[in-house]
């Protein structure tokens, strides 16, 4: 997150981290039920660990943290390269969470966001627009949903109904490492960090997010059948 601020501790209890190796964070994720996470399809890796209830970027133990393995990763069957449509993936964890003030699921919005809606995006991604400079703690940033027209004008030929743009205040954006993390509007999960241009946070180059209102049925059906 570029030019965000430290999230309040436990204010984003649905925020998850996907880790490679001992502790290398590579993507964000969102807790949507006691045993299921959502993340971006482009975050798919064969082996990873899941950390919930953690505020710090560092591996230091925190009392609210819970660690999990992913036992099933289900990318949306329509995820495509190089267009990046349908950029979402469900992850089933090896057990259910212990519900606490640090770890709670978020409800997915059934209605699509409208232009001007204020939302919160969060993550541990780089805080510098063009270099890796990771934060000490989870970062939060208020962003505004942009019109479909403005979104398509920013990225001609690259936007479809499975995406929406938000942000566009120069110097503020999601960035590398935030992928798969939550965009929450009015208390409901509206999107996932999907993609944007380098360097991050350029004028007229807003963040592009997976438009989750288009996938409520697929998410429910997939969870029910797995």
């Amino acid at each position: 997150i570029v030019n965000g601020s430290d999230c309040q501790k436990d204010a984003q209890p649905w925020q998850g981290a996907l880790l490679l190796g001992p502790n290398k964070l590579y993507c964000g994720a969102v807790l949507i039920s006691p045993q299921w996470l959502l993340t971006a399809a482009h975050c798919r890796k064969p082996v990873f660990r899941i950390r919930l209830g953690h505020h710090s970027m560092s591996p230091v133990y925190e009392s609210g943290q819970q660690m999990f393995q992913g036992i099933k990763s289900i990318p949306h069957p329509g995820y495509s390269h190089p267009g990046h449509s349908n950029d979402l993936m469900l992850i089933k964890m090896n057990r259910k969470i212990r519900d606490s003030h640090s770890v709670k699921p978020v409800e997915i919005a059934c209605d699509c966001a409208t232009e001007g809606t204020r939302c919160m995006v969060s993550g541990w991604g780089t805080t510098s627009s063009s270099h890796n400079n990771f934060p000490k703690v989870l970062q939060c940033l208020n962003i505004t949903v942009l019109s479909e027209e403005r979104c398509k004008n920013s990225y001609p030929g690259q936007i479809d109904k499975t995406m929406f743009c938000a942000g566009d205040e120069e110097g503020r954006d999601s960035c590398q490492g935030d992928s798969g993390g939550p965009v929450v509007c009015n208390g409901k999960l509206q999107g996932l960090v999907s993609w944007g241009d380098f360097p991050c946070a350029q004028r007229n180059r807003p963040g592009v997010y997976t438009n989750l209102c288009e996938f409520v049925k697929w998410i429910k059906d997939t969870m029910n059948s797995n």
């Epitope: 971006a40 390269h81 270099h131 890796n132 690259q158």
Partner: antibody, heavy 127, light 108 residues
């Protein structure tokens, strides 16, 4: 300013293993989310991608060379390396190392252009 | 694998000419196309990335356009230092990363 320098033997015998190292100066190989790439160019021909390694040490190889190629990173020496086994005369080429700069973040991060190159080193395979 | 076809393979032009080189991908690559210039005995140099973005330090007479499968590199007014070989390159999510066969721009 970032600079790349290839090093290794200029002559390799057929069936042996070609080993090259790329030393990165003017910046840390592990500090930023770049790709580190090997490319070759046979005499009088075009450019051929050999493979890449990313920030997470995930490797990506050309399918035609995959069975013979290993790319690795040594962050303590600020170097990345290429090993190509069972070489033949067809592997004679100028070998370049390069930095791959991602074209975007998130899903766009897997796409990159090579913005910094070494000057290249000529490798001849001959007995 | 995605094939990249460049045309022409060579061309002769004079200083001041407008030069156009085309690159065609065998399937859509969105805007994930880069252009390089290579002079004899030298490493390639990145000119254009993401189909149309000018790499820092590259003169504005170079421009790129296109998306999907058809792309163009244009030199608006050829200069003596522009005589070189030009390559297009697509960078895929899945390997292999591939280059076009090259276009040699020679002095007429």
């Amino acid at each position: 300013q970032l600079q790349l320098q290839e090093s290794g033997p200029g002559l390799v015998k057929p069936s042996e293993t070609l080993s090259l190292t790329c030393t990165v100066s003017g910046g840390s190989i592990s500090s930023d989310d770049y790709y580190w790439v090997w490319i070759r160019q046979p005499p009088g021909k075009g450019l051929e991608w050999i493979g890449s390694i990313d920030y997470y040490a995930s490797t990506y190889y050309s399918p035609s060379l995959k069975s013979r190629v290993t790319i690795s990173v040594d962050t303590s020496k600020n170097q990345f390396s290429l090993k190509l086994s069972s070489v033949t005369a067809a592997d004679t080429a100028v070998y370049y190392c390069a930095r791959g700069r991602p074209l975007g973040y998130g899903a766009k991060h897997y796409y990159y252009g090579m913005d910094v190159w070494g000057q290249g080193t000529t490798v001849t395979v001959s007995s | 694998d995605i094939q990249m076809t460049q045309s022409p393979s060579s061309l002769s032009a004079s200083v001041g000419d407008r030069v156009t080189i085309t690159c065609r991908a065998s399937q859509s690559i969105s805007s994930y196309l880069n252009w390089y210039q290579q002079k004899p005995g030298k490493a390639p140099k990145l000119l254009i990335y993401s189909a149309s973005s000018l790499q820092s330090g590259v003169p504005s007479r170079f421009s790129g356009s296109g998306s999907g499968t058809d792309f163009t590199l244009t030199i608006s007014s050829l200069q003596p230092e522009d005589f070189a070989t030009y390559y297009c390159q697509q960078s895929p999510y899945f390997p292999p990363l591939t280059f076009g066969g090259g276009t040699k721009v020679e002095i007429k």
